[in-house]
């Protein structure tokens, strides 16, 4: 039979304080039968860290189920590492006996405990907000020691001052966490903006860690609506255009209504981006004037990003000029360009041109 070898593949393992350390160990044979024990250090003063056969080791978990058939993986995971756990760990195979007899040791794995902060994770608001509103961004970093740490916020490279930071716990601990919340006022130009959380710590040798978040995930820029009539064509058809401009995100549905009845519904897709990250979209409707005896009330209804619809109405005066007419001639343009999402009831907004 091939002679059993105990393999500890890593000479060293480095782990942040408070995290778990995995110490790998495999045997090359099922033979001989007998348990594995893990020790820290060598010689008579070595410390038993884990025994497969007996004992209570609350911080140590075998990576593989010891009862798994034909198990030759004797790796362990030590939870909640502290600087006191540093040292060299040995995986030792025993031969079954009365008592079990030490047979072979692995080469050892040196565990070093570092206390570097984790990469900052920046999270934004759960729902989008519009310009002029204030939104909160949170930055978190964990696992560092000592407790002293510096955190800064930037928006597009400019340092922010409106933030609150807490380092926990307040008392002594093997590792610490930092959580900071910054308040950012949105502007309509913020689609391409970015907030940065920067963490500086003694373990980082002057090279701070950064976490970023894009304001595009937090902002909603509502559209402007403008409805205009082009010159009447020779075939008595009027081309009415609804221009939807400066909106973000792209998710937008436009519905044309003729005298309150749905004429057409369109979804915005694959629109070119403006320099500021917003989108524009133009939709038009051809109205056959000769088919109508009375004025035609056209409504461009826009539902943006799941918000309440915004309406812009336009009346084509059929009786006034049965022949060709210029843009906006003998027409009533009703609506509003207000940018908040209230129901835009035409009865409340009459603008005669």
């Amino acid at each position: 039979e091939e002679e059993l070898q105990v393999i500890q593949p890593e000479k060293s393992v480095s782990v942040a304080a408070g995290e778990s350390a995995t110490l790998n160990c495999t045997a090359t044979s099922l033979i001989p039968v007998g348990p594995i024990q893990w020790f820290r250090g060598v010689g008579p003063g070595r410390e038993l860290i884990y025994s497969q056969k007996e004992g209570h080791f609350p911080r140590v978990t075998p990576v593989s189920d010891p009862t798994k058939r034909n198990n030759m993986d004797f790796s362990i995971r030590i939870s909640n590492i502290t600087p006191a756990d540093a040292g060299t760990y040995y995986c030792v195979k025993f031969r079954k006996g009365s008592p079990d007899v030490e047979l072979k040791s692995g080469a050892g794995t040196e565990l070093s405990v570092r206390a570097k902060p984790s990469a900052p994770v920046v999270s934004g608001p759960a729902v989008r907000a519009t310009a002029e509103h204030t939104v909160s961004f949170t930055c978190e970093s964990h696992g560092f020691s000592p407790r002293d740490i510096t955190l800064k916020w930037f928006k597009n490279g400019n340092e922010l001052s409106d933030f609150q930071t807490n380092v926990d716990p307040a008392g002594k601990s093997v590792s610490y966490s930092i959580r900071s919340t910054a308040r950012v006022v949105l502007t309509r130009r913020d689609v391409h903006s970015q907030v940065i959380c920067e963490v500086a710590h003694v373990t980082l040798q002057g090279d701070p860690l950064r976490g970023t978040a894009n304001l595009s995930e937090a902002i909603r820029v509502p559209p402007f609506l403008e409805v205009t009539q082009q010159s009447m064509r020779a075939d008595n058809q009027v081309n009415v255009t609804c221009q939807v401009t400066k909106f973000y995100p792209q998710r937008l549905q436009l519905t044309w209504l003729e005298n309150g009845n749905v004429s057409r519904t369109e979804m915005a897709s694959a629109l070119p981006e403006n320099k500021d990250g917003t989108y524009n979209w133009t939709s038009w409707l051809l109205v056959n004037v000769s088919a109508h005896r009375d004025d035609v009330k056209l409504t461009c209804q826009v539902e943006h990003d799941g918000q309440p619809a915004v309406n812009k109405s336009f009346s084509v005066k059929v009786s006034a000029h049965p022949k060709e007419q210029g843009s906006n001639t003998a027409a009533e343009n009703t609506g509003t360009n207000e940018r908040d999402y209230k129901d835009d009831d035409d009865k409340h907004h009459h603008h005669h041109h």
């Epitope: 099922l30 039968v33 056969k53 007996e54 004992g55 034909n70």
Partner: antibody
């Protein structure tokens, strides 16, 4: 030192049930399978079933699947084997045995529990 | 299920002589380079005792006059020089699948 101490002898009537216990010591109970084996008088060994105390995973001999139930109590490191609907041919010594190498073998044995089924 | 058949059913051997017990499996008990055969010794009034694991490996504390050999479907337990304390019933067991035992071989002194 691994020890498996079994409960005392039982006399049961046909149709009754019996529950044999096996208390383990000298090792981490949840790290090793426990097997149950029986031996009728003057007969050979017959494997009944096995249980992993860490998660109560069990494997049964098809012959006993409908009548035997293995359980464990990890707080007391005790394994149990219950056999229902006893017949006279269930009269046997019932052994628990620990699998030290996870090879589905029987490295350490209890001393056995004699179950007699008689009307 | 794998069926194990031991031969002979009983065996009488003189003290100091070699005793050989065979165990044949109804299909191969080999897997991943190991032969999943185990040999047990049972003396009257005692539980069985593991002698050999994985076909050829002597268990802890077992005298080296005991040995196991074989692969695939045919296996042998050998006692090189029979001692009086070796009188017992010997069982083979497989665990390539779920455990099954052979019917046993009774070893006596001639």
């Amino acid at each position: 030192q691994v020890q498996l101490v079994q409960s005392g002898a039982e006399v049961k009537k046909p149709g009754a049930s019996v529950k044999v216990s096996c208390k383990a010591s000298g090792y981490t109970f949840t790290n090793y399978w426990i097997n149950w084996v029986r031996q009728a008088p003057g007969q050979g060994l017959e494997w009944i079933a096995m249980i992993d105390p860490s998660d109560s995973e069990t494997h049964y001999n098809q012959i006993f699947k409908d009548r035997a139930t293995l359980t464990t109590d990890t707080s007391t490191s005790t394994a149990y084997m219950e056999l229902r609907s006893l017949r006279s041919d269930d009269t046997a010594v019932y052994y628990c045995a620990m699998d030290y190498g996870s090879l589905y073998a029987m490295d350490y044995w209890g001393r056995g529990t004699l179950v007699t089924v008689s009307s | 299920d794998i069926v194990l058949t031991q031969s002979p059913d009983s065996l009488a051997v003189s003290l100091g002589e070699r005793a050989t017990i065979n165990c044949r499996a109804s299909k191969s008990v080999s897997s991943s380079g190991y032969n999943y055969i185990f040999w047990y010794q049972q003396k009257p009034g005692q539980p069985p005792k593991l002698l050999i694991y994985l076909a050829s490996n002597l268990d802890s504390g077992v005298p080296d006059r005991f040995s196991g050999s074989g692969s695939g479907t045919d296996f042998t337990l050998t006692i090189s020089s029979l001692q009086a304390e070796d009188v017992a019933v010997y069982y083979c067991q497989e665990s390539r699948e779920l455990p099954t035992f052979g019917q046993g071989t009774k070893l006596e002194i001639k």
